[in-house]
Interface confidence: low
């Protein structure tokens, strides 16, 4: 064309893949009627018309952008839509009259690629290679034009370093005119990278400006031979009888040596290996204090073949003995005096304490509980705890039973028993004593007796209710050697003035329970008239 | 004591099936990389497939990739090679070996399992 | 890619015999050498720069120069008569493993 050279630099639309391009004819009312002019695209130099404007009224030519022109802006401005990266050329237009001037536009087409795709070498890098090895590959897909690439480790940029840093990038165009990048990163990596974090940063333009996404952050598994083995025992802190404790070896280097765990003998000072689970861990379930002593680890480096040492350990189990109490079960007369004494042993300082079994009540801080002056009501259990107070849950009790001389004690000495007739009644009767009672009815029925303790007893009698027992009443009698006691119950029928819904009743220290005898699984808990309670 | 077992080898005709199996102990089995490795009789050794010590990714020789899958289930220390569409030129003897540093080195090997494929 | 080895060699009993292995990945890599006897499997003899696997007598050595590994046994025993392979990652796909085709040596 005449006078090309001497044409300005053609004017830049910058757009992005998919949208819209307006491509605006630049010539002047005195270069060009824009109601005839014709429109070209530029390929390798070659033209091709693509769009023809007549009396204002655009017509597309047939080829590849037949269908995405028209006119806008009084026919000043040619549309193209749904750009692609091949739309990247210059477009012209060219007026005819009053003579032949054209106008130049260059449409410049941007794409963001997608989110950069980090894969790391799973199979890992050892730090003794020859040369960098593959640390992880970066993929960005579908960006236009190419994206740059910029790996990072810890953040900061990698640059290529000859031996240790080598970054292989790699491109493919897509069937959409589209650029997938590939970036590997290679490098020589040291033990200290093991928990180095590595990720990649696409570059790319928009018609906005410059911009960039960034990979997630990958680890890469480092191999390193083994320079140290220790010993780490779970749960920290002090050790106690019954914990479950977990002794592992742990090395610096990776894959982990071959580990084994070995227990100094005491008696022979020898190293004697320790039976450990699959994943070579020592675990002591429930640890006893045998368990204490001097451990350590060897573990044998595959890749050196050296075996490393770890620090021995001393492993205290702490503990406490069997109590022992003494006496061990003392039997005593009343108004005499009893001295009980708690020994036990301990890898600690132990704190004993006396308790009253039946009450929890403390009694005595100390090994040492003295009795005095011995009444029947102190009779009963007495536990002895002995604790190491600087180990929360370290202690053992031991019970013992003081049994006082004497003959049967009633838990009531007479009581009243609402019932009606016919119906089975369940009676009960509980008696205390040493030697422990025993209990028999003036009446059949089906009687059972349980021992409550040492010194306590209660039995249970299941009886029809008859008007000959509504007559005599029930009584138990509870008999020991040092003699018996007996216990009454009267039998009063209920009717419907006896019980009114405000009647102020209550029960006794037992209850019965009346049963209609002709239907067996009804019962009902008989409700008692105040009375005084009485011991015998 | 670091110990593979391999298993599962036999007569197969050409285009049939087998499923090799390897079991592993003495070793934290899901820490390494695992190899199978076959031997032609009277020929030298042959890399057939690999696998990552999660199981997550595998790699396959030339000779058997599309027809060869190697697997493994770490709950049970046990690596596998299923081989379909088998050829006369798969007779071998396969070993398991486990693979230190994920590449370097086959540090252990088991004693092998006989393939044969005829009609 | 692919490892080269020469077929077979032979060594008087108490002297000294190197085998080589040749290929472009030993530019990268170190080549790892397994000593396989009749009927038996394969073990490790030398790995990484010049490391004894675990029982292997010190006579035997590895040592790398170029695109060349060497495998030497120094005062050869009868017991080291066996088929010799060399191994390494292949440099056009680091996850893929070559071996050399190996060498027989015979102690006379």
């Known amino acids: 064309v005449p006078g090309e050279a001497e044409q300005p630099a053609p004017e830049l639309v910058e757009v992005e893949v998919g949208s819209t391009a307006l491509l605006k004819c630049g010539l002047s009312q005195s270069q060009g009627n824009l109601s005839h002019v014709d429109w070209f695209s530029v390929h390798k130099e070659k033209r091709t018309l693509i769009f023809r404007v007549r009396q204002g009224q655009g017509q597309s030519e047939p080829g590849e952008y037949e269908q995405r022109l028209s006119l806008q802006d009084r026919g000043a401005t040619l549309a193209l839509t749904q750009v692609t990266p091949q739309d990247e050329r210059i477009f012209l237009c060219q007026g005819k009259r009053p003579r032949s001037q054209e106008y130049r536009i260059q449409l410049r087409v941007y794409k963001a690629p997608e989110e950069p795709n980090i894969q790391v070498n799973p199979l890992g890098i050892p730090v003794n290679s020859k040369e960098p090895e593959e640390v992880a590959t970066c993929v960005g897909r579908n960006g236009y034009p190419i994206p740059q690439v910029i790996w990072y480790k810890n953040g900061r940029p990698l640059k290529e370093e000859k031996n240790r840093v080598h970054i292989q990038s790699s491109q493919t165009v897509e069937s959409s005119g589209l650029y997938t990048l590939q970036s590997i990163l290679k490098a020589q990596l040291v033990k200290e990278d093991k928990d180095a974090q590595f990720y990649c940063e696409l570059n790319y333009r928009l018609p906005s400006g410059n911009h960039m996404k960034e990979s997630r952050e990958v680890t890469v598994p480092v191999f390193y031979p083994t320079e140290k083995v220790w010993l780490e025992v779970e749960p920290v802190g002090m050790l106690k009888e019954g914990d479950r404790v977990e002794i592992r070896c742990l090395a610096d280097g990776n894959p982990p040596p071959h580990f084994s765990i070995s227990k100094q003998n005491p008696s022979t000072r020898e190293a004697e290996e320790e039976t450990t689970n699959d994943n070579g861990v020592l675990v002591l379930e429930p640890a006893r204090k045998e368990h204490s002593g001097r451990y350590e680890c060897q573990g044998l480096d595959l890749d050196t073949m050296i075996s490393l040492l770890s620090e021995p350990q001393e492993l205290l189990v702490n503990y406490v003995s069997d109590v022992r109490v003494s006496p061990a079960a003392p039997e005593r007369q009343e108004g005499s005096s009893l001295t009980l004494t708690c020994e036990a042993e301990s890898s600690q300082d132990l704190e004993f304490q006396w308790l009253r079994e039946e009450t929890g009540q403390v009694l005595e801080r100390g090994p040492v509980l003295q009795l005095h002056d011995l009444k029947r009501e102190a009779g009963g259990g007495y536990r002895c705890v002995a604790s190491v107070p600087s180990i929360p849950g370290l202690n053992r009790t031991q019970l013992v039973n003081v049994a006082i001389f004497g003959p049967p004690w009633m838990a009531f000495k007479e009581r009243k028993v609402w019932v009606k007739e016919n119906m089975v009644l369940n009676l009960s009767c509980e008696a205390s004593g040493h030697p422990r009672p025993t209990i028999s009815w003036n009446v059949n029925g089906t009687a059972s007796e349980q021992d409550q303790d040492p010194q306590r007893v209660l039995s249970t009698l299941n009886v029809l209710v008859t008007p000959e027992l509504l007559e005599t009443g029930v009584e138990c009698t509870a008999s020991n050697d040092l003699g018996k006691n007996t216990s009454i119950l009267f039998l009063e029928l209920v009717n419907l003035t006896t019980l009114t819904p405000d009647s102020n009743t209550t029960t006794g220290l037992s209850t019965s329970t009346a049963s209609p005898h002709t239907r067996a699984n009804s019962t009902s808990t008989e409700r008692k008239l105040p009375e005084p309670e009485s011991r015998g | 004591e670091v110990q593979l077992l391999e298993s599962g080898g036999g007569l197969v005709q050409p285009g049939g099936s087998l499923r090799l199996s390897c079991a592993a102990s003495?070793?934290?089995?899901?820490?390494?990389?695992m190899s199978w490795v076959r031997q032609a009789p009277g020929k030298g050794l042959e890399w057939v497939s690999a696998?990552?010590?999660?199981?997550?990714?595998?790699y396959y020789a030339d000779s058997v990739k599309g027809r060869f899958t190697i697997s493994r289930d770490n709950s049970k220390n046990t690596l596998y090679l299923q081989m379909n569409s088998l050829r006369a030129e798969d007779t071998a003897v396969y070993y398991c070996?486990?693979?230190?540093?994920?590449?370097?080195?086959?540090?252990?090997w088991g004693r092998g399992t006989t393939v044969t494929v005829s009609s | 890619s692919e490892l080269t080895q020469d077929p077979a060699v032979s060594v008087a009993l108490g002297q000294t015999v190197s085998i080589t292995c040749r290929g472009d990945?030993?530019?990268?890599?170190?080549p790892t050498w397994y000593q396989q006897k009749p009927g038996q499997a394969p073990i490790l003899v030398i790995y990484?720069?010049?490391k004894r696997a675990s029982g292997i007598p010190d006579r035997f050595s590895g040592s790398d120069s170029g695109n060349t590994g060497s495998l030497t046994i120094t005062g050869a025993q009868a017991e080291d008569e066996a088929a010799y392979y060399c191994?390494?990652?292949?440099?056009?796909?680091?996850?893929?493993?070559?071996f050399g085709g190996g060498t027989k040596v015979t102690v006379l």
């Open positions: 191994s390494s990652r292949d440099s056009s796909d680091n996850h893929l493993r070559l």
């Open positions: 990484g720069k010049n």
């Open positions: 696998i990552s010590g999660s199981g997550g990714s595998t």
């Open positions: 070996a486990r693979d230190l540093y994920g590449g370097f080195v086959f540090d252990y």
């Open positions: 990945s030993l530019k990268n890599y170190y």
């Open positions: 003495g070793f934290t089995f899901s820490s390494y990389a």
